[in-house]
């Protein structure tokens, strides 16, 4: 920052609430799409340009005027892998977090015209090109269809689809949200011969029902009904199939070959949790028991003579956890070598740190190729010579991210490709590799302004800067911006990291109000090196509030000892650690311990509420947005991963003593703002309704706000502005700020 250390002499404006809500200062991205091993697409002034990665020269791939006469607002586009067609998406209608329906048209890039025959139907739920060529698979009305050519009729693959009952090629609510993080449940083989798909059956899954009020003119509210398995309830069942798309014909029904779950899964409830093609005729499936501490990977080969898929028991790989659950959120995906006979996978090592292990398909044991008291975040690319991964090893900072490569012929030869590129500005990287990993884009997201650069894998040479946010940097020179502190405290001989957004001209001899911004869910991380312009930026810059976050027990990327500490005990250590963090912050000398607040959303709303209901005396006030209040109200896959089942034989006792409602009496000691969207499909309004009822029943005065027809994100433009304005008023009143 330019100016002086003296706040009174600094005439620059602060970052205001309006700046946040109106997005006055915009971070520039550089979103590219690789189309080959040396070319990528980039949208500039609505023209789609194709860039040569090596030389940086570009040409117009598609002019912005091409679709002037189209008559629809194009939401997204997707180019076929062979570059012959472009799929245009319009009439986008959001469903849940990832799911939506849309209309699609296909433009022939050679003929320079829209294909008007055999069009994809409106309200299509998912569409995807094959990995090579230009086949299309799509899901409409819960059934799967394939187009061999864009202008040819679709071949119907399934006939069983039924709304809210049978889902072919798409996920139901819980699989979308908690397992695949996607609407799609379709997986093309690498050359597009086979299409694998999952089928979910929600026949017995109970429905969540809530009112949707819609337009003022609607006399009777609509009732939304969603199959949603709450903890302990009946779950969806899953089947898995593969169809050979070369066999499809209009005059005979497609033959889908089922691959059944391993016997060790079929003994009880289970999930399909990963699908990865290893080769053209080899597929790996990972299955997970409902009690999520045991998973099995099956490796299945196509038998050409029978047209069936065979999964040899000798090739099964079991992954289990004795201290918690498998994977960070689910078992990690395998990265197969070219021949499909071996793969690399992130698993927990004996010390409980997640590292890369090398598996051969016919051998049970694997060889760890990385080790240390840090974790591998993700495998990003695999070539014949190197494996590229992101980890938080550098400088022992769990909240950092850097790109590494490891030589496959000698695992001791590890190079950090990003660590020293710009060490002050850039400590948190993600990466996007070209098709065969010849080039890569590094995306640095902090602690300085985001920086996008292009590199060659041949010599790891930086080729060029794609976006450096210099225009934003110039603008922010004229703003009194907060600073960010990332550090750790030691509790019980363990490092726990925190971050603080500190007001401009921070003076450690002064006393500041502090807002604890909490999430604290399993495998979460709130203390990191990412640059953000958010509500906290406003609170620190304009209101001189310190906004802190703390990663206590249960948080991720620091080993299972920390992460699995809350296994079967949600609402305990992660809650206590937020309170302890606030106490520690109070002792640092610059915090006004009479003005400490806490806020969080979703799991953070639960922790906020549990903290405020703890009777600790540390917090004056807090805000819970869309909180969980009782784990039996939340979905089965997420909840049971950490809590087991709400049965007397399993963990019912802790389900019952980890509710917000049981702490109602203690809310008399704090100021509480409770907020929820009425159309929250994820954390149901029911959860806040029950908090409210419990507080009313014991005579607690509290503030509340509902957002009509808003879901878990409360993200519509008006609601977003309203909620942050409302919360700002609440915090300012709590802290006695003008």
């Amino acid at each position: 920052n330019k100016g002086t250390d003296d706040a009174t002499a600094d005439s620059r404006k602060t970052y205001t609430l309006t700046d946040y809500l109106k997005n006055t200062y915009r971070l520039k991205l550089y979103s590219l799409r690789w189309i080959s091993d040396h070319e990528y697409l980039y949208k500039q002034e609505n023209n789609i340009l194709v860039f040569n990665a090596e030389y940086g020269n570009s040409s117009v791939f598609l002019e912005n005027s091409t679709f002037d006469e189209f008559g629809h607002s194009i939401n997204d586009y997707s180019i076929s892998p062979d570059g012959q067609f472009i799929l245009l998406e319009y009439n986008y209608v959001k469903q849940w977090r990832h799911s939506y329906t849309a209309s699609y048209d296909i433009y022939d890039l050679n003929k320079r015209q829209l294909i008007t025959e055999e069009r994809i139907p409106n309200n299509t739920q998912w569409v995807t090109w094959s990995p090579v060529g230009h086949k299309l698979a799509y899901v409409w009305n819960n059934d799967i269809y394939v187009k061999i050519e864009p202008n040819l009729p679709s071949y119907r693959i399934t006939w069983t689809g039924k709304e809210d009952i049978i889902y072919n090629g798409i996920t139901d609510w819980v699989y979308e949200e908690e397992v695949f993080s996607a609407y799609s449940a379709l997986w093309w083989s690498p050359n597009g011969t086979f299409l694998a798909y999952a089928q979910f059956n929600d026949t017995e899954v109970p429905l969540i029902e809530y009112s949707f009020y819609s337009d003022e003119s609607l006399q009777y509210p609509k009732t939304v009904r969603v199959p949603y398995p709450k903890a302990g309830a009946v779950n969806p069942t899953v089947k898995f199939f593969v169809v050979n798309t070369d066999s499809l014909s209009s005059v005979t029904n497609a033959t889908s070959i089922q691959i059944t779950a391993p016997a060790s899964m079929l003994i009880g409830d289970h999930y399909l949790c990963d699908v990865t093609w290893a080769t053209q005729e080899r597929i790996s499936l990972q299955w997970l028991r409902r009690i999520q501490n045991y998973s099995v990977m099956d490796i299945c080969d196509y038998d050409e003579s029978s047209g069936r898929w065979n999964c040899l028991v000798a090739r099964q790989h079991i992954e289990m956890s004795t201290t918690g659950w498998v994977g960070r959120f689910r078992p990690s995906e395998p990265h197969f070598t070219l021949d499909g006979n071996s793969f690399y996978k992130i698993i927990s090592n004996e010390e409980g740190y997640r590292h890369i292990c090398y598996f051969q398909i016919d051998k049970k044991d694997c060889t760890f190729i990385t080790k240390g008291t840090w974790e591998v975040i993700g495998i990003e690319a695999l070539t014949s010579d190197y494996l590229y991964y992101i980890s938080n090893e550098y400088k022992g900072m769990p909240g950092g991210r850097n790109l590494y490569k490891i030589q496959l012929s000698d695992y001791t030869k590890v190079t950090c490709l990003s660590c020293e590129l710009n060490p002050e500005r850039c400590q948190y990287y993600s990466v996007s590799f070209s098709k065969e990993a010849k080039y890569y884009q590094l995306r640095c997201s902090g602690p300085g302004l985001p920086l996008y650069t292009l590199h060659s894998s041949v010599n790891d040479k930086g080729l060029r800067v794609l976006e450096d946010n210099s225009a934003l940097d110039k603008m922010l020179q004229n703003v009194q911006m907060p600073s960010k502190k990332l550090d750790f405290i030691i509790l019980n001989e363990t490092k726990f990291w925190y971050q603080m957004i500190l007001p401009p001209h921070f003076d450690k001899s002064k006393k500041y109000p502090l807002l604890l911004d909490v999430y604290a869910g399993p495998c979460s991380q709130k203390a990191d090196t990412v640059f953000r312009l958010n509500w906290a930026t406003y609170l620190a810059s304009t209101e001189n509030i310190i906004v802190a976050s703390f990663d206590g027990r249960g948080s991720g990327y620091q080993g299972d000892k920390i992460m699995h500490a809350i296994n079967r005990r949600l609402g305990t250590f992660e809650v206590e650690d937020q309170i302890e963090a606030a106490r520690q912050f109070s002792k640092m000398g610059f915090v006004d311990n009479k003005r400490i607040a806490i806020w969080g959303w979703s799991y953070g709303g639960y922790v906020t509420s549990m903290v405020l209901g703890s009777g600790s005396g540390v917090f004056k006030c807090g805000i819970a947005v869309a909180p969980v209040s009782r784990w039996e109200y939340y979905d089965s896959v997420y909840t049971e991963r950490y809590m087991g089942l709400p049965t007397p034989e399993d963990n019912l006792d802790h389900y019952r003593n980890s509710t917000v409602m049981s702490r109602a009496e203690n809310f008399k000691q704090v100021e509480y703002l409770l907020i929820h969207g009425t159309a929250d499909d994820n954390v149901h309004f029911q959860q806040s309704a029950q908090i409210s009822k419990a507080l009313v029943d014991v005579g607690v005065d509290f503030q509340a706000m509902w957002y009509t027809d808003e879901d878990h994100g409360i993200a519509s433009s008006t609601a977003h502005q309203h909620i942050y304005t409302h919360m700002s008023h609440f915090i300012k009143q709590c802290f006695s700020l003008p």
Epitope: L152, P153, S250, V251, S305
Partner: antibody
Framework: EVQLVQSGGGLKQPGETLRLSCTAS????????VHWVRQAPGKGLEWMGV???????DYDSSFMSRVTISKDTSKSTAYLQLNSLRAEDTAVYYC??????????WGQGTTVTVSS | DIQMTQSPSSLSASLGDRVTITCSAS??????LNWYQQKPDGAVKLLIY???NLHSGVPSRFSGSGSGTDFSLTISNLEPEDIATYYC?????????FGSGTKLEIK
Amino acid sequence: EVQLVQSGGGLKQPGETLRLSCTASGYSLTTYGVHWVRQAPGKGLEWMGVIWGDGRTDYDSSFMSRVTISKDTSKSTAYLQLNSLRAEDTAVYYCTRNRHDWFDYWGQGTTVTVSS
Amino acid sequence: DIQMTQSPSSLSASLGDRVTITCSASQGIRNSLNWYQQKPDGAVKLLIYYSSNLHSGVPSRFSGSGSGTDFSLTISNLEPEDIATYYCQQSIKLPFTFGSGTKLEIK
């Protein structure tokens, strides 16, 4: 390279049973259907039936009672059996590969003459 | 069954000519129509699938069009190797049926 090589045929007596073979190479019979089409002397092409990749069969109703199409995937061979031969079954018989909704590769054809 | 009617049954044209063969279906078959070429030695080849799509390896002088009930095959620049009999075939419904053929000769 995809190829269909036909064998069998020749001179048959009325009432006899015809069994023709069609050996495929370059692809699997579990993936693509094999159709049988015949052509009587001086006439056009006539579809007889199909065995699909999964082994299901469909026949033209005019041959339904007399025809059987089968395959041995281990030998990559499809078969046409036509019972109770009569003079009007004299024709060139073709096997052809089903790709989606068209016949993309054809056998060379085999001549069958039914005569006493 | 769907009847396929092809015309003419035979035609004579000169090298370099543009030749059109038509085919009509007894009921609507959308675009589910294929064209085949049978050489004098009996060898059969796919030319066009789904009304207008050229099979790989087929010269671009061949083109197909039409939908519903009326279809045509056009050879834009007749060459000597095009001497053959041409058949249309519907593939929308079993049993598959062929046209009666058009024999093309060189004048």
